[in-house]
Interface confidence: medium
């Protein structure tokens, strides 16, 4: 499956709206850093199957796309910027979607990668943790954002190398 | 793939309800809303109302009263039904794909072309 | 509601020709929520350009969009026979009901 050039635009829209999202700077957040273990193992370039990737990619954006769909993002967050981000996440996911059904030829993930997306949900679910026990403050978001920001760079990493190797 | 395939009656009488079934395959209910447009020759393309992923709706305002979306997880369906039909709702009526709020539609059903007429 | 006014109704150009279509709002539209959509007959409405600028998946590079406000347009830079089609514009923010302009049908000269 051939992901088309608009895909990649949009990944690099994504990232330059998650930057712009950013509003203080990330030394004044210094205490409130966290480590979430974002599942590197998932992204390396272990012999996946080509359909492995897509749909842990996909659940990746798709599990971004819920964590910034909630009312707290949009009370914290810059709201144009938001729905940008919905609106350039949702044309990934389409784009993602046609090509697992081309690979897999189903649209949910085969449970012989559940692992693989087990793992990425874990990750969001340590996230929306921090955000929670931080009460949604404004250095709580920016450390999420640049965690965000840093695994989404990482899954278009993968997604170029899926590229090189067609 | 992902599709949207529309069911319903192609005549509905005047004063009559109308029922349309939106059967879709290829992603999850949970993740997506259903919207639901018209296109008449009069009015050109006009949103009637949405059923999010939750299973809560909003409608246009000027059909609210008139207008009921749901949905059957289990079964993969949306339903439309709209009340008291006149000859100006002759149109084809649409159901289409939404991800969030503010998403443009990437996929539509095919359309159901509906006459009121005696 | 915000109205949106197509023009002009119908045009027709030849092949290789430049086509601008407008698309002008009652009031205000942020870029992010302005969207172009074509419909050819008897086939429901394709997403062609995404908030003002973006092309959709699979849309050729002829196509274009812009603007900002209450002021909006697509272009084809170099018409083909399969742009005959009819052009929507849609905008749709946090208030219902989302609303579509009148249409521009494309014609071939």
């Known amino acids: 499956c051939d992901l088309p050039q608009t895909h990649s635009l949009g990944n690099r829209r994504a990232l330059i709206l998650l930057a712009q999202m950013r509003r203080i700077s990330p030394f004044s957040c210094l205490k409130d850093r966290h480590d979430f273990e974002f599942p590197q193992e998932e992204f390396d370039d272990k012999q996946f199957q080509k359909a492995q990737a897509i749909s842990v990619l996909h659940e990746m954006i798709q599990q971004t796309f819920n964590l910034f769909s909630t009312k707290d993002s949009s009370a914290a967050l810059d709201e144009t910027l938001l729905d940008e981000f919905y609106i350039e996440l949702d044309q990934q996911l389409n784009d993602l979607e046609s090509c697992v059904m081309q690979e897999v030829g189903v649209i949910e993930s085969p449970l012989m990668y559940e692992d693989s997306i087990l793992a990425v949900r874990k990750y969001f679910q340590r996230i929306t943790l921090y955000l929670t026990e931080k009460k949604y403050s404004s250095c709580a978001w920016e450390v999420v954002l640049s965690e965000i920001y840093r695994s989404f760079s990482l899954s278009i990493n993968l997604q170029k190398r899926l590229k090189s190797k067609e | 793939q992902v599709q949207l395939k529309q069911s319903g009656p192609g005549l509905v009488q005047p004063s009559q309800s109308l029922s349309i079934t939106c059967t879709v395959s290829?992603?999850?209910?949970?993740?997506?809303?259903v919207h639901w447009i018209r296109q008449s020759p009069g009015k050109g393309l006009e949103w009637l109302g949405v059923?999010?992923?939750?299973?809560?709706?909003d409608y246009n305002a000027a059909f609210i009263s008139r207008l009921s979306i749901t949905k059957d997880n289990s079964k993969s369906q949306f339903f439309f039904k709209m009340n008291s039909l006149q000859a100006k709702d002759t149109a084809i009526y649409y159901c289409?794909?939404?991800?969030?709020?503010?998403?443009?539609?990437?996929?539509w059903g095919q359309g159901t072309l509906v006459t009121v007429s005696a | 509601q915000i109205v949106l006014t197509q023009s002009p109704t119908i045009m027709s150009a030849s092949l290789g020709e430049r086509v601008t279509m407008t698309c002008t709002a009652s009031?205000?539209?942020?870029?992010?929520?302005l969207h172009w959509y074509q419909q050819k007959p008897g086939s429901s409405p394709k997403l062609l350009i995404y908030s003002t600028s973006n092309l959709a998946s699979g849309v050729p590079a002829r196509f274009s969009g812009s603007g900002s406000g209450t002021s909006y347009s697509l272009t084809i830079s170099n018409m083909e026979a399969e742009d005959a089609a009819t052009y929507y514009c849609?905008?749709?923010?946090?208030?219902?009901?989302?609303?579509f302009g009148g249409g521009t049908k494309l014609e071939i000269k």
């Open positions: 290829g992603f999850s209910l949970t993740s997506y809303g």
């Open positions: 009031s205000s539209v942020s870029s992010t929520y």
């Open positions: 289409a794909r939404g991800r969030g709020n503010y998403v443009p539609f990437t996929y």
């Open positions: 849609h905008q749709y923010h946090r208030s219902p009901p989302m609303t």
């Open positions: 059923i999010w992923s939750g299973g809560n709706t």
